[in-house]
Interface confidence: medium
């Protein structure tokens, strides 16, 4: 089951899965110039049994010629607004979720990709959040969004993460950036777009993690 | 089940000081910011103060700033509000929040009433 | 410090009634907004957050839309459990700011 939002927004933070469960969708985008090859996938699938997990199809994308009307896959400005891309500074791995039996892991890149990975999650995805540079968090532990199905319909679970200036002490963000539409009340139709911006996993972990800038919920 | 109740609440006269309490419990409060809102009677709500988990990052309305406090103490699930130099327009009604989220969870409310 | 302007300030409406309350931030907030009802005595419960998100557990007949300095809270079909007052809260900057607040009353 697709979740049918995306996960919610924090003022100066970013998320980061760790991991994909199986069923998870990331759309084959092609940087401007580039299109997707005309017998390409639209899309690779996380896929898999109870011991093995991959990546099913393949991204290819080839030169656009100059007289290409063919719209950019790359998002153009106007479209961007719509999406949310997170950009991580150096993200932390709580858990190696990537061996966990039903997840995969980060996909490699392929040639000419776009810098925007557009990624549709299903219900049980986790993501992690944590401050960009120059931000700290006023909670502690690991601030993090489940996808959960509550009476047939999605909703993400709200990290509780505060991320505040360091320098800027008169400046005090807030919580969650708007989704596009109410947890279960669509107001309009709102597709399932997830991007991150060249998030290529990092695997080892945070030599910060005892001062993890992660929040966690309430236990 | 989470669970604020603020103390210390009265009457006070101008210039003088009260400190108010806000006994938390029902999640892990050595891991939450957490704020003062105040509301004085018959009227709207304002933030006073907020503070980080570890009490390293404090933020003050202008309205309080150099007169009142915020602080914590993580071991015994308290958070303070110490106020000092008291004047009229600080009566009010104030509440102790969890400032994850902007005010998800609130206490009932404690009113200090400035007097002479 | 942004300003928060709710209008109107106090509404009578009745049981079924569609009631629209509306909130002018004094500068852009990005939708970094919260609002909130309030019941004599009692502490504010917040309904909805980030301009539109419904807080878990608030009736679906609430509903938030808006952007940029305007927001607007809808209750699509007033229930009697719904009269009290209202306040808009803009998060994007330090110190968060309320609006003075819409007392909706039964008409």
């Known amino acids: 089951e697709l979740c049918d939002d995306d996960p919610p927004e924090i003022p100066h933070a970013t998320f980061k899965a760790m991991a994909y469960k199986e069923g998870t969708m990331l759309n084959c985008e092609c940087k401007r110039g580039f299109r997707r090859i005309k017998s390409g996938s639209l899309y690779m699938l996380c896929t898999g049994n109870s011991s093995h997990s991959s990546w099913d199809n393949q991204c290819q994308c080839t030169s656009s010629a100059t007289r290409n009307t063919t719209k950019q896959v790359t998002p153009q400005p106007e479209e961007q607004k719509e999406r949310k891309t997170t950009e991580m500074q150096s993200p932390m791995q709580p858990v190696d979720q990537a061996s966990l039996p039903g997840h995969c892991r980060e996909p490699p890149p392929w040639e000419n990709e776009a810098t925007e990975r557009i990624y549709h999650f299903v219900v049980g995805q986790m993501v992690y959040y944590q401050c960009v540079q120059g931000y700290r968090a006023l909670h502690r532990g690991p601030a993090e969004s489940v996808c959960k199905m509550t009476h047939g319909k999605t909703r993400w679970t709200q990290p509780q993460l505060i991320c505040t200036g360091e320098m800027e002490t008169s400046q005090f963000p807030g919580e969650e950036k708007p989704q596009a539409s109410p947890e279960g009340r669509p107001e309009s139709e709102t597709s399932c777009l997830v991007t991150t911006t060249d998030f290529q996993i990092q695997t080892e972990m945070a030599a910060t993690m005892e001062t993890s800038i992660f929040t966690t919920e309430y236990q | 089940q989470v669970q604020l109740v603020e103390s210390g609440g009265g009457v006070v006269q101008p210039g003088r000081s009260l400190r108010l309490s806000c006994a938390a419990s029902g999640f892990t409060f050595s891991n939450h910011a957490m704020a003062w809102v105040r509301q004085a009677p018959g009227k709207g709500l304002e933030w006073v103060a907020v503070i980080s988990y570890d009490g390293s990052n404090k933020y003050y309305a202008d309205s309080v700033k150099g007169r009142f406090t915020i602080s914590r103490d993580n071991a015994k699930n308290t958070l303070y509000l110490q106020m000092n130099s008291l004047r009229a327009e600080d009566t009010a009604v104030y509440y102790c929040?969890?400032?994850?989220?902007?005010?998800?969870?609130w206490g009932q409310g404690t009113l200090v009433t400035v007097s002479s | 410090d942004i300003q928060m302007t709710q209008s109107p300030s106090s509404l009578s409406a009745s049981v079924g009634d569609r009631v629209t309350i509306t909130c002018r931030a004094s500068?852009?907030?990005?939708?970094?907004l919260n609002w909130y009802q309030q019941k004599p005595g009692k502490a504010p419960r917040r309904l909805i957050y980030g301009t539109n998100s419904l807080q878990s557990g608030v009736p679906s007949r609430f509903s938030g839309s808006g952007s940029g300095t305007d927001y607007t809270l809808t209750i699509s079909s007033l229930q009697p459990e719904d009269f009290a007052t209202y306040y808009c809260q803009q998060y994007n900057s330090w110190p968060w700011t309320f609006g003075q607040g819409t007392k909706l009353e039964i008409k």
């Open positions: 929040t969890t400032g994850w989220n902007s005010g998800y969870d």
């Open positions: 500068q852009s907030i990005s939708s970094y």
